[in-house]
């Protein structure tokens, strides 16, 4: 029997290196069967995930997946960090893996850590 659970397809340990000043769309791929669930984005702050209430979002449909998109127009230096999308479905809360944005501020040319650095500093990924 085909699964009709809601699925959020953000890849585990996914990351995106982006430039401050550029536009960027962060995708939360959502699979559902009947009624589209209520989906939100939050930004991780320590162990809590702070809901992003007043940010521009939109839906995009393709094939059997919908994409709940968080818009950065433009990306700001303080957009650096880890994000998660969540879906409310039949009174259940389903949370995605976190996805990390590494924002390079063109002015300061600060670079995101290398994968080797991240391996030795796992709190960058698991916050």
């Amino acid at each position: 029997k085909e699964s009709c659970d809601v699925q959020l397809y953000i890849k585990r340990q996914s990351e995106h290196s982006i430039l401050a000043g550029d536009p960027f769309e962060l995708e939360c791929p959502v699979k559902y069967c009947a009624n589209r669930p209520h989906v939100t984005w939050c930004k991780l702050n320590g162990t809590t995930c702070v809901k992003l209430e007043d940010r521009q979002t939109s839906w995009k449909e393709e094939k059997n997946i919908s994409f709940f998109i968080l818009h950065f127009e433009p990306v700001l230096p303080n957009d650096n960090g880890s994000y998660r999308c969540s879906a409310n479905f039949q009174s259940n809360l389903i949370e995605s893996h976190s996805t990390t944005l590494y924002v390079t501020d063109v002015k300061s040319a600060s670079e995101r850590p290398s994968k080797d650095e991240m391996a030795s500093r796992p709190w960058l990924l698991y916050r």
Partner: antibody
């Protein structure tokens, strides 16, 4: 309808760099993830790596030191470079769209032989 | 990386037979598993995703089940065009494929 087409030399000398390009039509590489997979003659499938819609990459740990995947959004192409090749890298190389839950669109594959 | 072990590596069957292929993951992957069909000289074709969801355009005789570490692909009534090699695939951080199961004509 999204279609993928691999291109590149079919013969590469040992110790040289294998370079392949995947051209995407009917869709944009600015969404989704885009993978390279290979299949040695008579063997199974091996994932090489992917590039995301933002340009971030993830590689098979066993190949990581030799692999680079990049994208050219203006041409709607993504590319594979595999350095220091040996006969063990002889395979059919496929590009595919990683539609989050699996690879739903594949190129037809291109055969690369490593031989002097 | 997570390893996938498929069994059997090959099987012989007749048209109309019910065929079952299993895939075992070296650690739990929830339902993050897909199944592909590959015919000689062709690219793989996605059949099943999320362990049990049928990809668009795939005949309903194909079905998938399982969660965690043990998964099954079933062909309810084998058709002539189903003779091929089948692969399972987990799409965790480092994706991997099973070794394949070749379905041959008895």
């Amino acid at each position: 309808q999204v279609q993928l087409q691999e291109s590149g030399p079919g013969l590469v000398k040992p110790s040289e760099t294998l370079s392949l390009t995947c051209t995407v039509s009917g869709g944009s590489i600015s969404s989704y993830y885009w993978s390279w997979i290979r299949q040695p003659p008579g063997k199974g499938l091996e994932w090489i790596g992917y590039i995301s819609y933002s340009g971030s990459t993830n590689y098979n740990p066993s190949l990581k030191s030799r692999v680079t995947i990049s994208a050219d959004t203006s041409k709607n192409q993504f590319s594979l470079k595999l350095s220091s090749v040996t006969a063990a890298d002889t395979a059919v190389y496929y590009c595919a769209r990683d539609f989050y839950y699996g690879m739903d669109v594949w190129g037809q594959g291109t055969t690369v032989t490593v031989s002097s | 990386a997570i390893q996938l072990t498929q069994s059997p590596s090959s099987l012989s069957a007749s048209v109309g037979d019910r065929v079952t292929i299993t895939c075992r993951a070296s650690q739990g992957i929830s339902s993050a598993l897909a199944w592909y069909q590959q015919k000689p000289g062709k690219a793989p074709k996605l059949l099943i995703y999320d362990a049990s969801s049928l990809e668009s355009g795939v005949p309903s005789r194909f079905s998938g089940s399982g969660s965690g570490t043990d998964f099954t692909l079933t062909i309810s009534s084998l058709q002539p065009e189903d003779f091929a090699t089948y692969y399972c695939h987990q799409f965790d951080y480092y994706p991997t494929f099973g070794g394949g199961t070749k379905v041959e004509i008895k």
